[in-house]
Interface confidence: low
């Protein structure tokens, strides 16, 4: 969790002098309660926005917006604490709106916004706006919280953000899988325009999908420049057990921008429907999956199973 790196953060608006400060997420009013405290925010909204850094990188940000209730407690409102909690890591980041002048009633409802929290693809956050000073112990809460799920890199707008592009989101491997005779499976995919190694991982399951019965990994060495965007083929020799027929194939790149943490692409090949005239055929009904980033180095065991080769079609 971090703040977008550029432009002075502002919260001032006509009729209010305000400054944005870093916060420890523990406002002084927790420790030294006040007698008179403001009411809670109203209509908290969180939306996905996109913002450029000074370097020109594009990042997803949480756009946080809320309004004030139209009651006399705004006379005691000294500011607001904005807190963003990343749910999978319990990491929290806060900023504080510090009002340098007293709010007055005016004809329009007071409205505030902040768009500088950088968020990660596919992550869920809890966004909280606390009005300050915070309430006395056992006082009515004066905060509002909402959860916010950031789309992953498959989302059209997210795909072109810097974190997604760094993870390889622009690469479409267009994986195809073909069953061959002699218990073989041929995987083809399109190489990206970078001289980088790839791994193709095959894990096979029983028809019921609850029993992993075979796994193997093949390495593809970095292609030459003239092979960029060409198709690479890998042939796996499968388990001899006919029931070990549900195959999950992953292609993992090692792009320089994400190394061991690139987005993986995967296809699932279901067990064939048994009929009297079953012949080997290309698998047309594979299910494409967008795999999450994964800490690689955690490769599957190979045990020297299967035969491996790859070549590029020109």
């Amino acid at each position: 969790l971090r703040l977008l790196d550029h432009r002075a953060l502002v919260c001032s608006q006509p009729g209010l002098n305000c400054t944005v400060k870093n916060s420890t997420c523990l406002d002084d009013s927790w420790i030294h309660p006040r007698n008179l405290t403001p009411s809670s925010p109203k209509d908290l909204q969180i939306q996905l926005h996109f913002a450029h850094t000074q370097q020109g990188d594009l990042f997803p940000v949480a756009h946080i917006e809320w309004t004030l209730q139209t009651d006399a407690s705004i006379l005691y409102l000294e500011g607001a604490e904005l807190s963003v909690l990343q749910l999978n890591t319990n990491e929290r980041l806060c900023v504080k709106f510090q009002f340098l002048s007293m709010l007055q009633h005016h004809r329009k409802r007071w409205r505030f916004s902040f768009s500088h929290f950088v968020v990660d693809p596919g992550q869920e956050y809890e966004v909280t706006v606390h009005h300050l000073p915070k309430p006395i112990p056992d006082g009515d809460p004066n905060h509002q919280s909402k959860n916010f799920l950031v789309p992953d890199c498959e989302h059209a707008r997210m795909k072109v953000t810097t974190p997604c592009m760094s993870s390889g989101s622009l690469w479409d491997p267009n994986i195809t899988v073909e069953t061959l005779e002699a218990h073989q499976l041929r995987v083809s995919f399109t190489l990206w325009n970078e001289s980088t190694p790839y791994q193709v991982l095959l894990e096979s399951f029983s028809d019921s999908e609850n029993h992993s019965c075979f796994d193997v990994v093949k390495q593809i060495f970095a292609p030459r420049q003239e092979e960029f965007h060409q198709r690479a083929n890998v042939t796996f020799t499968l388990s001899k057990f006919h029931w070990c027929c549900h195959h999950h194939v992953q292609v993992q790149p090692f792009f320089s921008s994400c190394l061991n943490d690139c987005l993986r692409h995967a296809v699932t090949v279901p067990c064939p429907v048994i009929s009297n005239t079953t012949v080997p055929k290309p698998v047309a009904d594979y299910i494409p999956l967008w795999e999450p980033r994964s800490g690689s180095s955690d490769y599957k065991d190979d045990d020297d199973k299967g035969s491996s080769h790859h070549h590029h079609h020109h």
Partner: antibody, heavy 118, light 107 residues
Framework: EVQLVESGGGLVQPGGSLRLSCAAS????????MNWVRQAPGKGLEWVSF????????YYADSVKGRFTISRDNAKNSLYLQMNSLRDEDTAVYYC???????????WGQGTTVTVSS | DIQMTQSPSSLSASVGDRVTITCRAS??????LAWYQQKPGKFPELLIY???TLQSGVPSRFSGSGSGTDFTLTISSLQPEDVATYYC?????????FGPGTKVDIK
């Protein structure tokens, strides 16, 4: 120059806590998974923990599971190891190490010494 | 979990000798094996990765071979600066276990 510098080691009593830090420089830290490896006095290397570049995948050795927490702050180019419920057998030099694409760990820090003793 | 064993645990050889250290995995790990050299009081240094690929800057007298469960690190002509402890490490999946080490010194 690619560099890893560990800090935070020291003497702590059994049951106590310590937080190690590893400051990275000279490379794009946010693109790399990272590891902690330790070495008890006169003993061999023991892998302790792994964290992927975006903290999406984390692993621990059985010997530290439930007691140690690995984390990172990519904005600060820093790796951390929070060590709780420390035992005598956690006494070691702790190294942070960067994995190499293709395998192994090609960049190591100088290590920081943790001594657990009453 | 996969166990890694090394042999011998220590060896003494003369300058110029060919030295061989073996590492064995309790299950197949393909070629997901690295070798490290650690000199006394220093941090480990990567010598070989992917079982047989020499890390840049490492002298060519070092070589690695093997796949599956049995791996070998060879020093073709032992030099005084090669006195160190050598470790293998698997990295196919967590835990990324090291072997117990082989201590090499000069006769």
């Amino acid at each position: 120059e690619v560099q890893l510098v560990e800090s935070g080691g020291g003497l702590v009593q059994p049951g106590g806590s310590l937080r190690l830090s590893c400051a990275a420089s000279g490379f794009t830290f946010s693109s790399y998974s990272m590891n902690w490896v330790r070495q008890a006095p006169g003993k061999g290397l023991e892998w302790v923990s792994f964290i992927s570049a975006r903290s999406s995948t984390i692993y621990y050795a059985d010997s530290v599971k439930g007691r140690f927490t690995i984390s990172r702050d990519n904005a600060k180019n820093s790796l951390y190891l929070q060590m709780n419920s420390l035992r005598d057998e956690d006494t070691a030099v702790y190294y942070c190490a960067r994995p190499k694409v293709g395998g192994g760990m090609d960049v190591w820090g100088q290590g920081t010494t943790v001594t657990v003793s009453s | 979990d996969i166990q890694m064993t090394q042999s011998p645990s220590s060896l003494s050889a003369s300058v110029g000798d060919r030295v061989t250290i073996t590492c064995r995995a309790s299950q197949g790990i393909s070629n997901y094996l690295a070798w490290y050299q650690q000199k006394p009081g220093k941090f480990p240094e990567l010598l070989i990765y992917a079982a047989s690929t020499l890390q840049s800057g490492v002298p060519s007298r070092f070589s690695g071979s093997g796949s599956g469960t049995d791996f070998t690190l060879t020093i073709s002509s032992l030099q005084p600066e090669d006195v160190a402890t050598y470790y293998c490490q698997k990295y196919n999946r967590a835990p990324f276990t090291f072997g117990p080490g082989t201590k090499v010194d000069i006769k």
